[in-house]
């Protein structure tokens, strides 16, 4: 019969023959022949291969370097890579999470719209009319101005996006 030019899924072509690929978690040590199966070997500790493959070397698990603010979120197996995330207060600089930066703080006049996670930075928003933030913070939202009326007081100083209103007593002369 004619030698194959293409092989089935989970097979590869070598020496005019279709050989089985190695399953995830194993690497290739010997190709198949007319008389023998493909020979595969499990990946070692701290190594992985996540696809059906014909690799002769397994990949090293990613190292979550604490000096870069990284820690292990999910330990790697022979079939999966280690997943890193950032220490509390830090977030990844890229999708691959190779290093971390400190969460951004929202300046006065801005509040936290979305608190940062290990993979995303703080999202700030300007405080709208009626709200303020007088601190630089990675957690604080914009606070509503104090309602002087509910305290039976009057506004003595208008609020801004950075300051609360100042309430004072009612003017007694006005009867």
């Amino acid at each position: 019969p004619e030698p194959p030019t293409a092989c089935r899924e989970k097979q590869y072509l070598i020496n005019s023959q279709c050989c089985s690929l190695c399953q995830p978690g194993q690497k290739l040590v010997s190709d198949c022949t007319e008389f023998t199966e493909t020979e595969c070997l499990p990946c070692g500790e701290s190594e992985f291969l996540d696809t059906w493959n014909r690799e002769t070397h397994c990949h090293q698990h990613k190292y979550c370097d604490p000096n870069l603010g990284l820690r292990v979120q999910q330990k790697g197996t022979s079939e999966t890579d280690t997943i890193c995330t950032c220490e509390e207060g830090w977030h990844c600089t890229s999708e691959a999470c190779e290093s971390c930066v400190l969460h951004r703080s929202c300046s006065p006049g801005f509040g936290v719209k979305q608190i940062a996670t290990g993979v995303s930075d703080t999202i700030c928003e300007p405080c709208p009319v009626g709200f303020f933030s007088n601190v630089s913070s990675a957690f604080e939202k914009c606070h509503p101005w104090t309602s002087c009326e509910t305290k039976d007081l009057v506004v003595q100083q208008a609020g801004t996006n950075k300051t609360d209103v100042v309430c004072g007593p009612q003017d007694r002369l006005r009867a």
Partner: antibody, heavy 119, light 106 residues
């Protein structure tokens, strides 16, 4: 028939190295990886590692990294293992083995090489 | 590493007696293989892929198990069965062996 012929017994001094061999015959040598297994006096079997006879890539048990070095000479159908900086702990029988034509198990073993480390 | 714990370490059985050797893995494996070794000889493949007898192995031998628990059974002990039996996993690197069970004839 498939044969794995190992080199003879070695009596060596502590601190030196020894290189033992395993010659494959009765099959195409590059079709199968060669594995090395240590059997100490306690009769315990320990997998040292394996070497691809075709690609030359070696895989080691972490425990034997720096102790064992596996190589292959395709032209003579022979696999070698060198053991470095020998101590009494390395005194053991060392076997080479290969799997069968199908499946992941050691179907064929060499006769073993006894390495004795003694001053 | 996947640790394989065999029990018992040593046992003796009379001819005709049923013998069971167990092998417990520290984490789950797909299959277990068994080797027989007699003094002064290399290990011999005895049972592969948990329950398949290697060529020339008498049918009184059988293997079973799954996950972390495996066993080798001899339905009726014979003198020639006296040997050391080792379980072995090829599932995770480093490949590992049990410490062996020495089976003696009573």
């Amino acid at each position: 028939q498939v044969q794995l012929q190992q080199s003879g017994a070695e009596l060596v001094r502590p601190g030196v190295s020894v290189k033992i061999s395993c010659k494959g015959s009765g099959y195409t040598f590059t079709d199968h990886a060669i594995h090395w297994v240590k059997q100490s006096h306690a009769r315990r079997l320990e997998w040292i590692g394996a070497i691809s006879t075709n690609y030359g890539a070696a895989t080691y048990n972490q425990k034997f990294k720096g102790k064992a070095t596996m190589t292959v000479d395709k032209s003579s159908s022979t696999a070698y293992m060198e053991l470095a900086r020998l101590t009494s702990e390395d005194s053991a029988i060392y076997y080479c083995a290969r799997r069968g034509s199908h499946g992941d198990w050691f179907a064929y073993w060499g006769q073993g090489t006894l390495v004795t480390v003694s001053a | 590493d996947i640790e394989l714990t065999q029990s018992p370490a040593i046992m003796s059985a009379s001819p005709g007696e049923k013998v069971t050797i167990t092998c417990s893995a520290s984490s789950s494996v797909s299959y277990m293989h068994w080797f027989q070794q007699k003094p002064g000889t290399s290990p011999k493949l005895w049972i592969y892929s948990t329950s398949n007898l290697a060529s020339g192995v008498p049918v009184r031998f059988s293997g079973s198990g799954s996950g972390t628990s495996y066993s080798l059974t001899i339905s009726s002990m014979e003198a020639e069965d006296a040997a050391t039996y080792y379980c072995h996993q090829y599932h995770r690197s480093p490949l590992t062996f049990g410490a062996g069970t020495k089976l003696e004839l009573k």
